[in-house]
């Protein structure tokens, strides 16, 4: 999960495995102030999961969320 520092969530580790696409309802990018660039996926249970924006599955999910 992202770590909040002064209300700015940052990620210090990424999930490597793909999450089920059907479990993800939205996403957001962490701030440029964070040391690691990250995408945060929000699951249908409102859990937040940090992912590496360079991973293929992450890019694929972002594209599909944008289109839906």
């Amino acid at each position: 999960s992202p770590y909040s520092s002064d209300t700015t969530p940052c990620c210090f580790a990424y999930i490597a495995r793909p999450l089920p696409r059907a479990h993800i309802k939205e996403y957001f990018y962490t701030s440029g102030k964070c040391s690691n660039p990250a995408v945060v996926f929000v699951t249908r249970k409102n859990r937040q999961v940090c992912a590496n924006p360079e991973k293929k599955w992450v890019r694929e999910y972002i594209n599909s969320l944008e289109m839906s």
Partner: antibody, heavy 119, light 108 residues
Framework: QVQLVQSGAEVKKPGASVKVSCKVS????????MHWVRQAPGKGLEWMGG????????IYAQKFQGRVTMTEDTSTDTAYMELSSLRSEDTAVYYC????????????WGQGTTVTVSS | SYVLTQPPSVSVAPGQTARITCGGN??????VHWYQQKPGQAPVLVVY???DRPSGIPERFSGSNSGNTATLTISRVEAGDEADYYC???????????FGGGTKVTVL
Amino acid sequence: QVQLVQSGAEVKKPGASVKVSCKVSGYTLNDFAMHWVRQAPGKGLEWMGGYVPEDGDTIYAQKFQGRVTMTEDTSTDTAYMELSSLRSEDTAVYYCATDPLYPPGLSPWGQGTTVTVSS
Amino acid sequence: SYVLTQPPSVSVAPGQTARITCGGNNIESKSVHWYQQKPGQAPVLVVYDDSDRPSGIPERFSGSNSGNTATLTISRVEAGDEADYYCQVWDSNTDHWVFGGGTKVTVL
């Protein structure tokens, strides 16, 4: 070093159920997503489903939906796969395999449990 | 659902290079994992994310992924490399892990 040790071989009659166990040692079960894969004699690998800890949910391959149940007992670090309404085509080696936080992919695997369905 | 196609068998002489293909529609957009399975044993991950090797896997094993084909390359093949090899991808349309049919590598 993570190790997965599975329960022993089973012989079942058609229509019965089988429950295979997979004990994790070296780490706690909470650290992993546990998946189950089967392999019929002389055939390839077939993914059955697995647990997604990030969402606290289990996903099942459509083919097995309604017939398979995957559970975990974190107090004993043991995962279970139960398959019901067995038929002869379910004769296979059943593997548990972990999907660790890193690297991606299934590694390591249990040694496999042979399930034979025969009348 | 997503289909992965592998040749049933590949034969190679010791010291030569074996190339095992895994075909799928626009597979380059997916991360491909490769497993080695020796007779009577559980599969072992040999390549993940197209081309990365887990620790303990020899450098002789390498992977690539472009267009509609991913390839596992085994250079300087040894007798101990004789095994079945499976490719695997995550299909986000079905939320399923998908395996190829497997390729039996025979060392002549």
